[in-house]
């Protein structure tokens, strides 16, 4: 390799100081070693994003409208595998429980709040509104293009993209993945959805010059608005029930 970088994660610091001079990359903000042949976990990416904000780095910063969930960005606690810890707290000792995509699923409390487990988000619904086109996209062509995108770019196994719905101008992409279905090397739907969200916003986490290039029969797909809904294996525990939109 002509230099030591992480093709799948811009938010890393890489060096060849490891055994045998092998290129090793650590996530900014956490110093956790990342596997650059696959997607980095959303928790480590959020942590890196917050550390970049604090240090004033201009790399891959969110647009002013970037909203991950109803609470906005926060500096998460990740476990040693880079996954979200069940309980998250801010600097003022306000705590809450999160699901596996890091979205709050309980009311906020104090440090006595208990979160027994990270509840898995097993169903992610990505809703896109595309820019007006001369004519509607062919549903079948759109379906195969989006399936190809998730398989090729994010390495998500095709079985985890359960459906693509289309009613012009709204596209819905359904990702489903139970804990029992996810193999050791399988990309998590949470990570695929987050990379896709950043790609759509023009904030790609990949190193290369190539941005997202989604086109159906030669017609580019330009996304105007994105909404992401997360459904957990257990219902959220809000005093007033609501579906979490990202």
């Amino acid at each position: 390799q002509s230099n030591c970088t992480c093709p799948t994660n811009k938010m890393t610091v890489c060096d060849t100081n490891g055994p045998g001079g092998v290129c090793q990359c650590r996530a900014m903000g956490s110093q956790v070693l990342v596997d650059c042949s696959t997607l980095t976990s959303k928790c480590l990416l959020l942590k890196a994003r917050m550390s970049a904000r604090k240090s004033g780095r201009s790399l891959v910063m969110p647009s002013e409208h970037a909203i991950l969930d109803n609470d906005g960005l926060y500096d998460p606690e990740c476990d040693d595998k880079g996954r979200f810890k069940a309980r998250q707290c801010n600097q003022t000792s306000v705590c809450w429980c999160v699901n596996s995509v890091g979205v709050r699923r309980t009311d906020k409390g104090d440090q006595s709040l208990r979160c027994d487990e990270v509840v898995r988000t097993h169903h992610i619904l990505i809703e896109l509104r595309h820019r007006p086109t001369d004519r509607a996209f062919n549903h079948s062509d759109l379906d195969s293009e989006l399936r190809r995108l998730f398989q090729e770019r994010y390495k998500l196994h095709p079985s985890f993209l359960s459906a693509v719905h289309y009613e012009e101008p709204t596209i819905q992409i359904e990702l489903r993945q139970n804990a029992s279905q996810k193999g050791l090397r399988d990309v998590d739907i949470a990570d695929a959805a987050y990379y896709f969200e950043r790609d759509i916003k023009g904030e790609s986490l990949f190193m290369g010059r190539r941005g997202l290039d989604v086109q159906v029969r030669g017609e580019p797909l330009h996304v105007e608005r994105t909404l992401i809904y997360y459904l957990d294996e257990k219902p959220p525990q809000f005093s007033m029930k609501r579906l979490t939109a990202g």
Epitope: F206, M207, D213
Partner: antibody
Framework: AVTLDESGGGLQTPGGGLSLVCKAS????????MFWVRQAPGKGLAWVGV????????NYAPAVKGRATISRDNGQSTVRLQLNNLRAEDTGTYYC???????????????????WGHGTEVIVSS | ALALTQPSSVSANPGETVEITCSGG???YGWFQQKSPGSAPVTVI????YRLSDIPSRFSGSASGSTATLTITGVRVEDEAVYFC??????????FGAGTTLTVL
């Protein structure tokens, strides 16, 4: 079956320019990246460049950067390599190749080539 | 790197298993067979481990980190050829190895 037919090779003069054309058939041309690869006599394969599906992105090897232009016509299912300021070291067989992974973060990789043309021979000599 | 690193030659008896390694790439690896100089290469493996439908099942590919391996299980005389690996460098410029000559004894 996928077929890639290159044309436009032959004897070229140093300092001049050449235009190679590759005609594709047997697949949905509009859905795939296209590559050019060359091989000097008695040498190995050398990646020349790539163009994405829409033609909005190209990438070139350092040896040809600034001298090469890859373009495509999706209506005609053709891809063209224009190479200017020719040198003796540009001599070789030029292959057109089909990419297989247009969305991949490493889509420019030679590891994404799944089909090759028969090649067209270029000789740069005075 | 200006080229990927692969052995210049390997040899084996018919029926044996042959492994050819390739290192120094960043991204997907492919393997290409060229039976004679000037003849068109044939893709044997693309995207690390995908085999084209008309390629015999004795050919397989794997990749780990920045190293890829082409394995021919039960090599045959007709497999004699030069095998090139392909990938990219970390600046996304495509790369090939110098080629490995496989001799079946």
């Amino acid at each position: 079956a996928v077929t890639l037919d290159e044309s436009g090779g032959g004897l070229q003069t140093p300092g001049g320019g050449l235009s190679l054309v590759c005609k594709a058939s047997g697949f949905d041309f509009i859905d795939y990246d296209m590559f050019w690869v060359r091989q000097a006599p008695g040498k190995g394969l050398a990646w020349v460049g790539v163009i994405n599906r829409s033609g909005s992105y190209t990438n070139y090897a350092p040896a040809v950067k600034g001298r090469a232009t890859i373009s495509r016509d999706n209506g005609q299912s053709t891809v063209r390599l224009q190479l200017n300021n020719l040198r003796a070291e540009d001599t070789g067989t030029y292959y057109c190749a089909k990419g297989v992974c247009t969305h991949c973060w490493d889509a420019d990789s030679a590891g994404n080539i799944d089909a090759w043309g028969h090649g067209t021979e270029v000789i740069v000599s005075s | 790197a200006l080229a990927l690193t692969q052995p210049s030659s390997v040899s084996a008896n018919p029926g044996e298993t042959v492994e050819i390694t390739c290192s120094g790439g960043s991204g997907n690896y492919g393997w290409f067979q060229q039976k004679s100089p000037g003849s068109a290469p044939v893709t044997v493996i693309y995207n690390n481990n995908y085999r084209l439908s008309d390629i015999p099942s004795r050919f397989s590919g794997s990749a780990s980190g920045s190293t890829a391996t082409l394995t021919i299980t039960g090599v045959r005389v007709e497999d004699e050829a030069v095998y090139f690996c392909g990938s990219a460098d970390s600046t996304y410029v495509g790369l090939f190895g110098a080629g490995t000559t496989l001799t079946v004894l």
